[in-house]
Amino acid sequence: CKAMHVAQPAVVLASSRGIASFVCEYASPGKATEVRVTVLRQADSQVTEVCAATYMMGNELTFLDDSICTGTSSGNQVNLTIQGLRAMDTGLYICKVELMYPPPYYLGIGNGTQIYVIDPEPCPDSDF
C-alpha cells in the first residue's frame, strides 16, 4: 500500500480528570474525501485499538457512542481527545490514518504520543 507522513506530539500529560488531547496531522499525498483515523495503544509490546472513526473531509469526526474518544477535524488535522484515563492507561498512543477514498489507498502511522496519566491524590478527610 502507499504511505504518507503522519505527525503527532511526542508527549502529552493527561489532566487530573483523566483527559488527554493531541493533534494528529497527515500530509495527504492525494485528494482524499473519506478518511479513517484509528488510535492504537502500545504497552509492553502489545498493541490494542483504542478507538476509530471514519469521516468525510469537511465533516465532523464521529466515534461510536460508547467510545472514550472524541475528535474534530480541520483540513488534514484531527484533534483527538481521550477521556476516562487512569494511571494504568499510561502508554504510547499511536495515530493511524487511512485515506479510504478515492483510490489510491494511503496509510500513515505516527511515531506515537506518550500519554502520562497520574491518578489524583484522594482528598484527605475533613471535618468541615
Epitope: 504511505a3 507522513h5 505527525a7 503527532q8 506530539p9 496531522e25 500530509a27 488535522q77
Partner: antibody, heavy 116, light 108 residues
Framework: EVQLVESGGGLVQPGGSLRLSCAAS????????IHWVRQAPGKGLEWIGW????????KYAQKFQGRVTISRDNSKNTLYLQLNSLRAEDTAVYYC?????????WGQGTLVTVSS | DIQLTQSPSSLSASVGDRVTITCRAS???????LAWYQQKPGKAPKLLIY???NRATGIPSRFSGSGSGTDFTLTISSLQPEDFATYYC?????????FGQGTKVEIK
C-alpha cells in the same frame, strides 16, 4: 508572492550551537509542512528534518537525531533550526523549504561556517 | 534508507541537444514521491518535476520526467543556454528524505 528568508548564519566555534530562522510570507504558513535541507560547499543536498503544520510533530534524519531541534512559531510565520555540538562538517548553506513531499519553494539559504 | 544514484555524474552537451539523466533507487519508490530539481551556482534548488512526471508551475515543456519503481529519468528535449546547471532527484517517502548526488550539465 511566496517567500522564505533564512537568517542567523555566520561563523561558529566547534562545539558551539546555532539557531537559524526562516521567515515566511505570501502564504498561509500554518497550512504547510516545512523542511530544513543543507548543502556543504561543493557537495549535494542533505535533508535534516521536517516539522508538521501545527508544529506538533517533527522528524529528523538519523544522523541529526539528538543534536537538532526544528520548531516553529505560527503566530510569527517563522521556522527555527537549533543545531548543537557543531563540528567542521556542519559547515554548509542551510535552506528551509516548503512542502510535505516535493519542495515547491526554497529560501535563499544562509551560510554557516564552523571553524576556530 | 533509500539511496538514489544518478548517472551520469556530469555531462557535456550543446545547445539543442537532447539530454537524459537517470536516477536509480536502492529500493522501490512510489512515483508520487519522486521529484527533480535544478540548481544553479549560488542559488537555491528549483522544483522541476514532481510525482515523477508532472511539471511544476512555470517549467517549460522541454523538461519531462518518467519512470517507476527503481528507475526514473529526467529528459531535456532541447537544451537551452539557461539549462546548464546541476540536477538532483529526490525521494520523499519513507523518511529520511534522500537526494541523488547530482548531475552537472556543462557546456560542450
Amino acid at each position: 508572492e511566496v517567500q522564505l528568508v533564512e537568517s542567523g548564519g555566520g561563523l561558529v566555534q566547534p562545539g558551539g550551537s546555532l539557531r537559524l530562522s526562516c521567515a515566511a510570507s505570501g502564504f498561509t504558513f500554518s497550512d504547510y509542512w516545512i523542511h530544513w535541507v543543507r548543502q556543504a560547499p561543493g557537495k549535494g543536498l542533505e535533508w535534516i528534518g521536517w516539522i508538521s503544520p501545527s508544529g506538533g510533530g517533527t522528524k529528523y534524519a538519523q544522523k541529526f537525531q539528538g543534536r537538532v531541534t526544528i520548531s516553529r512559531d505560527n503566530s510569527k510565520n517563522t521556522l527555527y533550526l537549533q543545531l548543537n555540538s557543531l563540528r567542521a562538517e556542519d559547515t554548509a548553506v542551510y535552506y528551509c523549504a516548503r512542502g510535505a513531499y516535493e519542495f515547491d519553494y526554497w529560501g535563499q539559504g544562509t551560510l554557516v561556517t564552523v571553524s576556530s | 534508507d533509500i539511496q538514489l544514484t544518478q548517472s551520469p555524474s556530469s555531462l557535456s552537451a550543446s545547445v539543442g541537444d537532447r539530454v537524459t539523466i537517470t536516477c536509480r533507487a536502492s529500493q522501490s519508490v512510489s512515483s508520487r514521491f519522486l521529484a527533480w530539481y535544478q540548481q544553479k551556482p549560488g542559488k537555491a534548488p528549483k522544483l522541476l518535476i514532481y510525482d515523477a512526471s508532472n511539471r511544476a508551475t512555470g517549467i517549460p515543456s522541454r523538461f519531462s520526467g518518467s519512470g517507476s519503481g527503481t528507475d526514473f529519468t529526467l529528459t531535456i528535449s532541447s537544451l537551452q543556454p539557461e539549462d546548464f546547471a546541476t540536477y538532483y532527484c529526490q525521494q520523499s517517502y519513507p523518511t529520511p528524505l534522500t537526494f541523488g548526488q547530482g548531475t552537472k550539465v556543462e557546456i560542450k
